[in-house]
């Protein structure tokens, strides 16, 4: 179905499940909040290790506009990026702050997307007559996943790009219609 590889051209940071690989981000008005959000949260899936609850993931937040061609989202979206290596929660903030990094001896734990939220964004386009919208799937949370030597690089890929919507049974389209969908959001576990 379709070409061998696919893309969607917006500035999403994260490629979407292999279907829509994204180019590198062009972040507009990018504010990095750089918070370690997930400290101490137990991972979504148990690993075969006893101190699972000790492992923590860094979730970095970026605020940016979604673009598509000459269009830009009316409002910025907040993108969550799962940051690299997992380590014991108590070591993460200080270790990162000092530029050091804890590495486990033994299995490799990586911080990868866990759940997604999808958001529909309204696009503002130059001279655009019709309201246009785009769906962007964004990472909602991260998790630590144990990687063995059998896991390949594809395990480490982040995923994402798409989104949400308004209500059924519409009468003939009023011009402002799609604004009702702007804030619709959902969360999806994969």
């Amino acid at each position: 179905q379709g070409w061998q590889a696919f893309k969607n051209d917006a500035t999403e940071i994260i490629p979407e499940l292999g279907e829509y690989p994204e180019p590198p981000p062009e972040l507009e008005n990018n504010k990095t909040m750089n918070r370690a959000e997930n400290g101490g949260r137990p991972p979504h899936h148990p690993f075969e290790t006893k101190d699972v609850s000790e492992y923590s993931c860094r979730e970095l937040h970026f605020t940016r506009y979604v673009t598509d061609g000459p269009c830009r989202s009316a409002k910025p979206v907040t993108e969550l990026v799962c940051s690299g290596q997992c380590g014991p929660a108590r070591l993460l903030p200080n270790a990162i702050g000092r530029g050091k990094w804890w590495r486990p001896s033994g299995p490799d734990f990586r911080c990868i997307p866990d759940r997604y939220r999808a958001q529909r964004v309204q696009l503002l386009c130059p001279g655009g007559e019709a309201p246009r919208a785009r769906k962007v799937r964004l990472v909602a949370s991260c998790k630590c996943k144990r990687l063995t030597r059998f896991h390949n690089q594809s395990e480490l890929k982040d995923f994402g790009t798409e989104a949400a919507r308004p209500q059924k049974g519409r009468k003939p389209r009023p011009r402002a219609r799609s604004a009702k969908a702007n804030q619709a959001e959902l969360e999806n576990a994969y």
């Epitope: 529909r120 769906k135 798409e162 308004p166």
Partner: antibody, heavy 118, light 107 residues
Framework: QVQLVQSGAEVKKPGASVKVSCKVS????????QHWVRQAPGKGLEWMGW????????EYASKFQGRVTMTEDTSTDTAYMELSSLRSEDTAVYYC???????????WGQGTTVTVSS | DIQMTQSPSSLSASVGDRVTITCKAS??????VAWYQQKPGKAPKLLIY???TRWTGVPSRFSGSGSGTDFTLTISSLQPEDFATYYC?????????FGGGTKVEIK
């Protein structure tokens, strides 16, 4: 791999309705917009409308307004297009397509032939 | 409705030829134009959107250009698999509309 698989060919009488289905796999249907485009025999492409399965928003071409209904079942990732009051000029191949925007058609189904004949 | 007029309606070309298809909009559509390729008995495939952005996986021999009312799809070196019908589509204003198609045949 994104795949859209449509229901089989239909033969209908004038005045009847037809409902075409489109099963989406490869991602949740609600993460994209669903579009419907038709093509009469030997003719070009004609956009019918789009729907947003997440919230049920729809946009129909004015030509089909009042005759077309686009719905989805998000539990089965299936989109439906129902066209009523069929006439002979509705004989066409009906395609479902999906995309992350309301305006371009990224992936397409294989098409469903609808023949309207008395 | 915005009319999209494609020319020529058909053309004959040989493998290796440079092929140019044009699409003229009945009013200014900025760059809100996509191009699709359709082979007989098959569904169309997206090639180009926003007038010049190639859909990933589309070979680099396909390129699009134009803005306003005049748009062009160029195949720099025609390959055997490129013999098909090509359609332009505008998405500046509802309803989205397609051109009548250009059939590229083997000379």
């Amino acid at each position: 791999q994104v795949q859209l698989v449509q229901s089989g060919a239909e033969v209908k009488k004038p005045g009847a309705s037809v409902k075409v289905s489109c099963k989406v796999s490869g991602f949740p249907i609600k993460h994209h917009f669903q579009h419907w485009v038709r093509q009469a025999p030997g003719k070009g492409l004609e956009w019918m409308g789009w729907s947003d399965p997440e919230i049920g928003d729809t946009e129909y071409a004015s030509k089909f307004q009042g005759r077309v209904t686009m719905t989805e079942d998000t539990s089965t990732d299936t989109a439906y297009m129902e066209l009523s009051s069929l006439r002979s000029e509705d004989t066409a191949v009906y395609y479902c397509a999906t995309g992350d925007t309301t305006y371009k058609f990224d992936f397409w189904g294989q098409g469903t032939t609808v023949t309207v004949s008395s | 409705d915005i009319q999209m007029t494609q020319s020529p309606s058909s053309l004959s070309a040989s493998v290796g030829d440079r092929v140019t298809i044009t699409c003229k909009a009945s009013q200014d559509v900025h760059t809100a134009v996509a191009w699709y390729q359709q082979k007989p008995g098959k569904a169309p495939k997206l090639l180009i959107y926003w007038a010049s952005t190639r859909w990933t996986g589309v070979p680099s021999r396909f390129s699009g250009s134009g803005s306003g009312t005049d748009f062009t799809l160029t195949i720099s070196s025609l390959q055997p698999e490129d013999f098909a019908t090509y359609y332009c589509q505008q998405y500046h204003d509802y309803p989205w509309t397609f051109g009548g198609g250009t059939k590229v045949e083997i000379k």
